[in-house]
């Protein structure tokens, strides 16, 4: 049976050109976390195994950075980037959790309403 | 002047699927996410989902994966959601309403289209 | 799914009364950055809901300065100041922060 829950950083709003750490934690579960992966609409930004590290897909090398931890840190945003993103905990006995995380990406100049955005 | 129309009232027999539609205007359609929220008869609201018009990626409330699609037409600023074989329990309000950015908010609604499902 | 609670179900009022609505949520609503966002709706009977609150205070456009919104974390609350006939109708809160986007039951604003 799958008790585990995945917490995650929460849905973030930030401006262009900037950067952001996605985070997930997963927690009540004595599970074995063998793999996360990292993904966004079916596309696989980065895996991180427990045994073989990190690998970043070719296309994000240039502004996907791993960790801290099994999180990810996206830098240099664009508008593009604007969507939801999976951490997929692969674990053993349990199965699969996963956790998503919406990333909106704002062009400086449209902050509506006086918007708070931080960026590490 | 932010307007989101859309379709008229629909009676439609259990098992089809059908479109409803949301055509923008009065704002950059692609500058800003479109949610889709439901009202069953006399019930609360739920969050089906949203699209970003710029990118075209969506966001489901898991509920509603397989039973709601979510679609845009740039070219005409109109939103679309895909209801799939419908039933009775599909009856309801369905509204579009604009994302507010930077908020996680919906800022402006449609008029809601209802949708009856009934043999 | 993070669920949202809103007290009470039904709140009977007279025009003028000063009335709070409550929202609590099954988990923090902040994100990691430190924003959290809880926002406020009005329902009125044949129409669509409208935006009062976002970002747990912040008005809307047009909205009156009667409605005020507080509260952090877990906690939320609404408040309107002179009750008038045109705020009655059902409020619901909204969770953005985690998906997927979940409202409250609704409360129901109605005269006593």
């Known amino acids: 049976m799958m008790t585990g829950t995945i917490e995650t950083t929460g849905n973030i709003s930030a401006e262009k050109g900037g950067s952001i750490i996605l985070q997930c934690h997963l927690s009540s579960t004595t599970a074995q976390v063998t793999q996360v992966n990292w993904e966004q609409q079916d596309q696989l930004l980065a895996i991180c195994n427990a045994d073989l590290g990190w690998h970043i897909s070719p296309s994000f090398k240039d502004r996907v950075a791993p960790g801290p931890g099994l999180g990810l840190t996206l830098q240099s945003l664009t508008v593009n980037d604007t969507g939801e993103y999976f951490c997929i905990y692969h674990t053993y006995p349990d199965g699969t959790y996963t956790g998503r995380i919406f990333l909106e990406v704002l062009e400086s100049s449209v902050a509506e309403h006086g918007a708070r955005f931080q960026i590490p | 002047e932010v307007q989101l129309q859309q379709s008229g009232p629909e009676l439609v027999k259990p098992g089809v699927s059908m479109k409803i539609s949301c055509k923008a205007s009065?704002?950059?359609?692609?500058?800003?996410?479109m949610n889709w929220v439901r009202q069953s008869h006399g019930k609360d609201l739920e969050w089906i989902g949203l699209i970003i018009p710029y990118n075209g990626g969506t966001s489901y409330n898991q509920k509603f994966k397989g039973k709601a699609t979510i679609t845009v037409d740039k070219a005409s600023s109109t939103a679309y959601m895909d209801l799939l074989s419908l039933t009775s329990e599909d009856s309801a309000v369905y509204y579009c309403?604009?994302?507010?950015?930077?908020?996680?908010?919906?800022?402006?609604w449609g008029q809601g289209t209802s949708v009856t499902v009934s043999s | 799914d993070v669920v949202v609670t809103q007290t009470p179900l039904s709140l009977p009022v007279s025009f003028g009364d000063q009335v709070s609505i409550s929202c609590r949520s099954s988990?923090?609503?902040?994100?990691?950055?430190?924003?959290?966002?809880l926002s406020w709706y009005l329902h009125k009977p044949g129409q669509s809901p409208q935006l009062l609150i976002y970002?747990?205070?912040n008005r809307f456009s047009g909205v009156p300065d009667r409605f005020s919104g507080s509260g952090s974390g877990t906690d939320f609350t609404l408040k309107i100041s002179t009750i008038k006939p045109e705020d009655l109708g059902m409020y619901y809160c909204?969770?953005?922060?985690?998906?997927?986007?979940?409202f409250g039951g609704g409360t129901k604003l109605e005269i006593k």
């Open positions: 909204l969770q953005g922060t985690h998906q997927p986007w979940t």
């Open positions: 988990q923090s609503l902040t994100n990691s950055y430190g924003n959290t966002y």
């Open positions: 309403a604009r994302g507010l950015r930077g908020y996680f908010a919906m800022d402006y």
């Open positions: 009065g704002y950059s359609f692609t500058g800003y996410t």
């Open positions: 970002g747990i205070s």
